[in-house]
Interface confidence: low
Amino acid sequence: QPPPPPDATCHQVRSFFQRLQPGLKWVPETPVPGSDLQVCLPKGPTCCSRKMEEKYQLTARLNMEQLLQSASMELKFLIIQNAAVFQEAFEIVVRHAKNYTNAMFKNNYPSLTPQAFEFVGEFFTDVSLYILGSDINVDDMVNELFDSLFPVIYTQMMNPGLPESVLDINECLRGARRDLKVFGSFPKLIMTQVSKSLQVTRIFLQALNLGIEVINTTDHLKFSKDCGRMLTRMWYCSYCQGLMMVKPCGGYCNVVMQGCMAGVVEIDKYWREYILSLEELVNGMYRIYDMENVLLGLFSTIHDSIQYVQKNGGKLTTTIGKLCAHSQQRQYR
Amino acid sequence: SAYYPEDLFIDKKILKVAHVEHEETLSSRRRELIQKLKSFINFYSALPGYICSHSPVAENDTLCWNGQELVERYSQKAARNGMKNQFNLHELKMKGPEPVVSQIIDKLKHINQLLRTMSVPKGKVLDKSLDEEGLESGDCGDDEDECIGSSGDGMVKVKNQLRFLAELAYDLDVDDAPGNKQHGNQKDNEITTSHSVGNMP
């Protein structure tokens, strides 16, 4: 079946092109040879000009970008929404964990509260910062918490007769805390639990944020001129022949799209791996790999660690008395 | 797990306290996210097809455009790229991905490596290494003093996810919430930890 004859006057082509580029007189009145065309190479007379071709290429690339954005809209929203939800959720968990820990001190060790609140606050601030990607060492955070707590426990509970704590004895007590393992293996336990759960939480958030970056990158891809030419030929060159209602062949479209998206499709392998690796991570996020579980139970372990100090109070006071005697003498003078 | 009013009291006539169908928590939210993400696992390989199906393509028409001429939809010419002399599709592919795409691929490789190293190997969470970390209620080592389960007034079963804390309380002039807060627990993966704080119900 031969193709229908082209529009003898280019009238239809003009009215369509006016919608793309209002007010411009780039459409020939009647079909022309079109020898200057580079994309829509005519087999006979054409209703397209070089300027029109350029406009079609621009429009085709814009269409492609919009199609790509609409393709990724649902996925993009899913990851953006979840990244925000989880970030806020983790902040809420940290806030509650801090409040539980403070409540434990207020309930059980009121004499420690003012300073304990301060140290607990600093610890959980660091926890939040770590989750958000800060370059903080979890072991240092835990050590700092126990280093800070011990002088207060010693001067307020174990040896309340001492004068107001002076930096000298505090420094000695901080050192003794580690040397004598005054909290037993609790600091090590907390380090293990907190570092494992926070590492996983942090990488989970990082992964979600990278997911957003991946979608954003492909969302805003600028397609090459070659791709623009292929798209133009597929979507608009038929208009030059006055064939306004005809659509591209399905197989042809697939070939063109694969050509245009050859680079993007290379992401596929790594994207699949990303989702499967994220699934594996999520499946393992329980017990000590679940920050909600670990942080909300921290008050209990800290409470147990202080009880451990109290239980060994007698032995410790004697040992520390000798170990920090020099600092104490300087205090009493 | 995490409970909320819509679950607890869905039916105003019958108090559905015993069987809550959606006991959702952060972990179930994570799993839900993964399930949704998995439906996008072929996203990039399916893009060309998606875009063709969302742009004008001849479906029911007898004739279609192959870039050069009008042809019958099922003819060999229909799939062929018209005007091959213009430029070659194969050449276009050979150029390789744009720099931004290469960059994002590198970032994906990096995060995938991190995710794999961070993932808990199957069975790891239940193995002996956790006992050594003091999490299980079995052996506590030679020094009973250091056994986590040995201090406190009573042992309470604590289930994974949100633990119920009771009466931690009294108004705190700290941050934004009183410490006297309660939170849920999940049925599976039980571990035992002692809680000697407050009155556990």
């Epitope: - | 797990s1 019958i14 015993a18 009183p178 309660q182 119900p201």
Partner: antibody, heavy 120, light 105 residues
């Protein structure tokens, strides 16, 4: 100090609508929910409904379904309760109270631990 | 709807004496998580209500330890070990986030 401050007394004719506000301060508004409770003169307390300040989820008492709408404005840490088609038996003191936080995956139940001063 | 029934409706008590209020629900308030979704509130004359006990037996922040809650399923009790003059008011039990009892004065 954690507190909820409600809008002033209102006088309305039958059939009209009323919108009571409840401004929260001293805590993170979106970490909790808000319940509304009313008390007719000389009567007991009646729970009207609940809204999550985190995501706007609501749960209304069946008796008021269709007449009551609860909303929040997180930018001003304010909760609102609107009651439409007022009847004479809606005459009451209306209280807002801080309640548990909820979204579809995260819920801590605290009881209604902080109350507003009431709006007549 | 679940019906909450309190008894007695009025309870005259001398300061220093113990007091006990009972609350019965028409259906079990015991959730599968092991907690009873029942709260106790006190409304002092001319004041807003205040939370005393939540989830059956948990004393709220700042509530004196002379107040205690007990019970499970459908039967609950609020006890005051030694009543003080400031404890005067109306006590309400509440099925969490749903229905109040009629109050005990």
């Amino acid at each position: 100090e954690v507190q909820l401050v409600q809008s002033g007394a209102e006088v309305k004719k039958p059939g009209a609508s009323v919108k009571v506000s409840c401004k929260a301060s001293g805590y993170t508004f979106t970490s909790y929910g808000i319940s509304w409770v009313r008390q007719a003169p000389g009567q007991g307390l009646e729970w009207m409904g609940w809204i999550s300040a985190y995501n706007g989820n609501t749960n209304y008492a069946q008796k008021l379904q269709g007449r009551v709408t609860m909303t929040t404005d997180t930018s001003t840490s304010t909760a609102y309760m609107e009651l439409r088609s007022l009847r004479s038996d809606d005459t009451a003191v209306y209280y807002c109270a801080r309640d548990g936080l909820s979204s579809s995956w995260f819920y801590y139940y605290y009881g209604m631990d902080v109350w507003g001063q009431g709006t007549t | 709807d679940v019906v909450m029934t309190q008894s007695p409706l009025s309870l005259p008590v001398t300061p220093g004496e113990p007091a006990s209020i009972s609350c019965r629900s028409s259906q079990s308030l015991l959730h599968s998580n092991g907690y009873n979704y029942l709260d106790w509130y006190l409304q002092k004359p001319g004041q807003s209500p205040q939370l005393l006990i939540y989830l059956g037996s948990n004393r709220a922040s700042g509530v004196p330890d002379r107040f205690s809650g007990s019970g499970s399923g459908t039967d609950f009790t609020l006890k005051i070990s030694r009543v003080e003059a400031e404890d005067v008011g109306v006590y309400y039990c509440m099925q969490a986030l749903q229905t109040f009892g009629q109050g005990t004065k």
